[in-house]
Interface confidence: low
Amino acid sequence: GITIPRNPGCPNSEDKNFPRTVMVNLNIHNRNTNTNPKRSSDYYNRSTSPWNLHRNEDPERYPSVIWEAKCRHLGCINADGNVDYHMNSVPIQQEILVLRREPPHCPNSFRLEKILVSVGCTCVTPIVHHVA
Amino acid sequence: GITIPRNPGCPNSEDKNFPRTVMVNLNIHNRNTNTNPKRSSDYYNRSTSPWNLHRNEDPERYPSVIWEAKCRHLGCINADGNVDYHMNSVPIQQEILVLRREPPHCPNSFRLEKILVSVGCTCVTPIVHHVA
């Protein structure tokens, strides 16, 4: 891979756990300046595979609140507004990074954790297994 | 909010930037032990709003590789396999946490960053503005 020269202004790395333990600045930098919330905020209701959002809260995690999508139907909404069970509503899942307080209840010590969240739902053609 | 008693085994927090700067252990704990990747890996192809996945790589970010979804069509795939432009394929977006090396090129110093990623696509009924 590419070797990037180390910045001489880097913090000291004498910690015996280095490089497993790193310093992280929690002042979040938000790169999402050009997003337009109006365009996407109601997709959960307008989708042919609509979903509800459920609040998952854990004070030992950062961020402490995560919203989880749950598909409303097994099937998908057809042009008449009815549920068509020849199609399936399925959750789109994504692995995300969160910080877990470790040791527990510590305000300034965390461990990276990877969790799977359902972000929304999509309508798919089902896989049909034909039995001979 | 709930006040949780502080663990006496917490690391020292004398850092002048505390609590903005915290220690993070990069040994990732993966909570997704029961997930079956095969179950959702082909949704991008089977969806009525199919998408392609594009690799976004940045060595100054952790994780350095992020996959971005791009909807294949403006419309959605109908029962005949054709694109129906009376419906819209739209990206489902999510804000995620990443770590950005700061100062640049430092192996052990990061800043939390929030970025918006497209995880997949869903099919929605368009908003039609009727002009009087």
């Epitope: 997709y43 959002l53 609140v65 995560i66 969160v98 969240v117 | 489902i92 999510q94 804000e95």
Partner: nanobody, 119 residues
Framework: EVQLVESGGGLVRPGGSLRLSCAAS????????MYWVRQAPGKGLEWVAK????????YYVDSVKGRFTISRDNAKKSLYLQMNSLRAEDTAVYYC????????????WGQGTLVTVSS
Amino acid sequence: EVQLVESGGGLVRPGGSLRLSCAASGFTFSSYGMYWVRQAPGKGLEWVAKIEQDGSEEYYVDSVKGRFTISRDNAKKSLYLQMNSLRAEDTAVYYCAKGEILPLYFDYWGQGTLVTVSS
């Protein structure tokens, strides 16, 4: 640190009114669209109303149109929801939220205020 603190909830009879308030801090309030969202017992999240940064545009879910009014006071960094002609189905925890209401996982939500509509 972003903080959103809701107040004004309570028990009210059908047909009654309530005014919810949300006090914001830790961010430039006037730069963001703001939402009221609600979660009824055992149900998913439902967005109720949205107001643009400058208050120029408002959006409502169909079930509250004509009954609820969203407003804001940027000088006071406050968001409001005037709820009239309340119905039993409006019973929920009401949250004010900053920005987008996709399934984000940032805690830019208050702890909520409970509205109970019952005779």
